[in-house]
């Protein structure tokens, strides 16, 4: 039967219909920066070209004996996971390997940098189709390695990296912490985060998604027909590199931002048991397991959004945290969160010609996070409208007054240390959907966007009795762009988007009375783009055989059905 | 990439009159910074990536590398340029004593310097 990991990333309808995943990825070249590889292994023979690039340090220890099979082990297995004939994700992808890790699996930042430069120069000398670079390695946080990854990504290369196997915050490692890189954590057959000895997969806001990374069957360098099971975030990253190759082969014009959004969109949601992660990391870690899209048809019309968390601000009174979207994305809303509840809200502000989301800590607070909602909205023209704190008791309000602009998000920011909970909450008057409302002592910021065919609506879910969490979700066909709490009083810890659901967190019930002061309303702004839907329909009408859909249906195989285990 | 900017010795002589090479000091208010791996066992002292400001050309990178070598030699320190970066980031990889970091940070065009460190298969 099909290995569990390939079953897990295969869309359900193809498992049910017993279709083989496509010999996809044929238009894509995947660069692997790893150990040496056994290029004549049956799984990868003819699929992997070994470049002459080698930059590795001397092995440690005087009694170290180089054994070819050990030297090639890691890289051979990963090449097999990406493009192996039998156990590979993207069986049509061609690969190029660069040796940056020695026989002990150790390399240097400088060697990796020179390797990335080699790829860039190769790309300039001989431009090919889409490029994916797989970095199944990790070191400590490195400004220069992250910068090199950023430059390569901005040159149109998709970089996929291992989150790291240190059971730690991935933001402390590179290249995992580089925002432009797609960072992958590892899960097992039970959708649990992978444990590796006393350690395990990294986690946190720098992880983009998880993928199968335990007990992965792949090419073994022990012999040219051998297979072996390996585990780690490298294996998880190899799955995502394979999926990326498939997606890019079906849609070669996809940008990095579009690819990342699609990877997130087509992932299995909320299947990971978060109890494995440290408590303070659970909210920051994406509960996503990578999967192939069922089809590229129907993807184009979607308004894709993702949530980007900032680094923690730190506890000083005036500390702030900033969350940023990728260059090709639009910041459609901005929210904030503080575990202590002591915060002074958030606002969208221009920085280097682009909007960013800034959250403000308050006196006595342990720090805040800024949470950006980053979306793909072609031809968008977005601006922020601000209303200063109101004198009137009705609260502060601001709306989108420009013709054709719709409200995509609301933020509020206050200078006072504590918005009193004794003041009655202010609910937005009905029939005014393009309006943000907030506490009278807060300034309110409305994100207003004009884009072809963009339409948005506001959804609220209010709970009169105090509750630790209030949620409201957008329905099928609509995408969550904004998430905020009404009215944003001090017992509200903050608001953030999880997939298509707006989550508002409040202080522990035991610390809040059951009076009306405990009332919390979660406000979701849900949008869709009629323009994208039309463009997608036109595209489907004028093209044939270009989607993953068609590739999937090209070849049948007797695969036994395996059901996706959701916990 | 080979060195295209004239004889190394010429540069040594040209720098004789300069006080520690500060004739072309960094622009006012912009101080180059030094970074190293937070995980001590992963550090590789003695090898440094000198990253230059974004718009620095290859010839300027090579010139800056030679300037560092010349100034280091005048203090009795050896330096070896292992690579000159261009294409992704401007800069160079150098083997040198950590004693030279203060000097290197004052070189023109330098944005930051990072000590080399280990990476591992995951």
């Amino acid at each position: 039967s099909i290995p569990w990991n390939l079953e897990r990333i295969t869309p359900p309808r193809y498992r049910a219909d017993e279709y083989q995943p496509p010999d996809g990825g044929s238009l894509v070249e995947v660069y692997l920066l790893d150990t040496s590889i056994q290029s004549d292994h049956r799984e990868i023979e003819g699929r992997v070209m070994v470049t002459d690039f080698e930059n590795v340090p001397e092995e440690d220890g005087t009694r170290f004996h180089r054994q070819a099979s050990k030297c090639d082990s890691h890289g051979t297995h990963l090449a097999g996971v990406v493009s192996g004939r039998d156990a590979g994700v993207a069986k049509g992808a061609s690969m190029r390997s660069l040796r940056v890790l020695n026989c002990q699996g150790k390399g240097t930042v400088s060697g990796t940098l020179i390797g990335l430069e080699f790829i860039r120069k190769s790309q300039l000398v001989q431009p090919v189709g889409p490029l994916v670079v797989l970095l199944p390695l990790a070191g400590g946080y490195s400004r220069v390695l992250n910068a090199a990854c950023q430059r390569l990504a901005r040159a149109g290369v998709v970089l996929v990296t291992a989150a790291g196997n240190f059971r730690d915050d991935a933001c402390l490692y590179s290249p995992a912490s580089a925002p432009e890189v797609i960072t992958v954590g590892a899960t097992n057959a039970q959708d649990q985060p992978v444990t590796l000895g006393t350690l395990g997969t990294n986690f946190g806001r720098c992880v983009d998604l998880f993928a199968p990374g335990e007990d992965i069957i792949g090419a073994s360098s022990d012999c040219s027909t051998c297979f072996v099971s390996q585990s780690g975030t490298s294996q998880a990253a190899a799955h995502v590199a394979g999926i990326a190759a498939m997606m890019l082969s079906a849609e070669p014009e996809l940008t990095l931002a579009e690819l990342r959004q699609r990877l997130i969109h087509f992932s299995a949601k909320d299947v990971i048991n978060e109890a494995w992660f440290p408590e303070d990391q659970r909210v920051l870690t994406p509960n996503l397991v990578a999967a192939l899209p069922p089809s590229t048809h129907g993807a184009g019309w979607q308004l894709f959004c993702r949530t980007v968390w900032s680094a923690h601000s730190g506890p000083t009174r005036m500390a702030t945290a900033v969350a940023r979207c990728a260059p090709d994305e639009e910041l459609l809303s901005c929210s904030s969160f503080s575990r202590s509840g002591k915060r002074r809200g958030e606002r969208m502000e221009a920085q280097g010609g682009k909007l960013v989301c800034r959250a403000h800590n308050a006196f006595g607070g342990e720090g805040v996070y800024a949470i950006a909602r980053c979306c793909l909205l072609p031809q968008a023209n977005c601006s922020v409208h601000t209303a200063p704190p109101a004198e009137a008791s009705m609260g502060t309000r601001v709306h989108c007054h420009q013709q054709g602009h719709v409200l995509t998000g609301c933020s509020s920011h206050w200078e006072v240390e504590d918005l009193g909970t004794h003041k009655p909450p202010v609910l937005r008057p009905r029939g005014q959907p393009n309006q943000c409302v907030g506490h009278r002592e807060a300034s309110i910021h409305a994100s207003c966007c004009h884009a072809p065919g963009l339409e948005c609506k506001v959804k609220e879910h209010g709970i009169p009795a105090p509750q630790e969490q209030v949620t409201v979700a957008c329905e099928e066909g609509w995408t969550l762009t904004g998430c905020s709490a009404l009215p944003g009083t001090s017992h509200v810890l903050g608001a953030y988007a999880v997939d298509n659901t707006c989550v508002v967190r409040s202080r522990d019930v035991s610390t809040t009375g059951s009076t009306s002061e405990g009332a919390v309303t979660a406000v979701a702004i849900c949008c869709r783009s009629r323009h994208l839907a039309q463009a997608s329909q036109e595209l489907q009408g004028s093209t044939s055989g270009s989607g993953l859909n068609d590739i999937f249906e090209a070849q049948k195989i007797e695969w036994h059905e395996h059901h996706h285990h959701h916990h | 990439q080979e060195d295209e900017d004239g004889d190394y010795e010429e540069l040594v002589l040209a720098l004789r009159s300069e006080e520690d090479g500060l004739a072309e000091a960094p622009e006012h208010g912009t101080t180059a910074t030094f970074h190293r791996c937070a995980k001590d066992p992963w550090r590789l002292p003695g090898t440094y990536v000198v990253v230059l400001k974004e718009e620095t050309h290859l010839s300027q990178s090579e010139r800056t590398a030679r300037r560092l070598q010349a100034q280091a030699a005048r203090r009795g320190y050896l330096t070896k340029i292992l690579h000159v970066f261009h294409g992704l980031l401007p800069g160079f990889l150098v083997k040198m004593s950590g004693d030279l970091l203060e000097l290197a940070l004052k070189l023109p065009h330098v944005d930051y310097i990072e000590e080399d460190s280990s990476v591992f298969a995951q």
């Epitope: 080698e54 930059n55 340090p57 060697g111 | 990439q1 320190y77 050896l78 292992l82």
Partner: antibody, heavy 121, light 107 residues
Framework: QVQLVQSGAEVKKPGASVKVSCKAS????????IHWVRQAPGQGLEWMGY????????KFNQKFKDRVTMTRDTSISTAYMELSRLRSDDTAVYYC??????????????WGQGTTVTVSS | DIVMTQSPSSLSASVGDRVTITCKAS??????VAWYQQKPGKSPKLLIY???NRYTGVPSRFSGSGSGTDFTLTISSLQPEDFATYFC?????????FGGGTKVEIK
């Protein structure tokens, strides 16, 4: 054990080119720079330049800058030195040497056996 | 280029003699000097690095000293296998120049 093995003797005509190889074994080839030094008959040693095999970065003695090319092939742990537009005074033994680097001192700790290049019409 | 002037260019000595070879740099090279021994038809072998550090496996009768511009290689008690040519090298700046060599012959 660590060693550098060079290609055999060459006889060349003036104006021709010669390519000398230096095969490394017993250590990680990309971990050390390889230098080329020549010695004319009965004369002293003359440094020609070096290559960093891990990045192909090269640095040459100005005297040879326009005529010398240094390359490497990591798959066979071999460095090459090519000297073009040969003249009779290029007749010499050409050595490759591995450079060992410590914190603030370095030296050539391993040398090839030498390759005799004779330039004669 | 830095010129390394080695003297004498040749000397005759007997087994057991103390032999001193000097090298003078045309400019300050601090302690960036190495000494090599070369026998006829063979490649050079490292003896001393950084002016005064004896390389692994080199007999203790070989010692180096000096800094700046003046350097000395001393063989405290000449042995039969020490009859060879000795070269100094500066690594302070490129090109990494060598001395002209000192040939030590049997008296």
């Amino acid at each position: 054990q660590v060693q550098l093995v060079q290609s055999g003797a060459e006889v060349k005509k003036p104006g021709a080119s010669v390519k000398v190889s230096c095969k490394a074994s017993g250590y990680t080839f990309t971990g050390y720079t390889i230098h080329w030094v020549r010695q004319a008959p009965g004369q002293g040693l003359e440094w020609m330049g070096y290559i960093n095999p891990s990045s192909t970065y090269t640095k040459f003695n100005q005297k040879f800058k326009d005529r010398v090319t240094m390359t490497r092939d990591t798959s066979i742990s071999t460095a090459y030195m090519e000297l073009s537009r040969l003249r009779s005074d290029d007749t010499a033994v050409y050595y490759c040497a591995r450079e060992r680097i410590y914190s603030n001192y370095w030296f050539f700790d391993v040398w090839g056996q030498g390759t005799t290049v004779t330039v004669s019409s | 280029d830095i010129v390394m002037t080695q003297s004498p260019s040749s000397l005759s000595a007997s087994v057991g003699d103390r032999v001193t070879i000097t090298c003078k740099a045309s400019q300050n090279v601090y302690t960036a000097v190495a000494w090599y021994q070369q026998k006829p038809g063979k490649s050079p072998k490292l003896l001393i690095y950084s002016a005064s550090n004896r390389y692994t496996g080199v007999p203790s009768r070989f010692s180096g000293s000096g800094s700046g511009t003046d350097f000395t290689l001393t063989i405290s008690s000449l042995q039969p296998e020490d009859f060879a040519t000795y070269f100094c090298q500066q690594l302070s700046s490129q090109p990494e120049t060598f001395g002209g060599g000192t040939k030590v012959e049997i008296k």
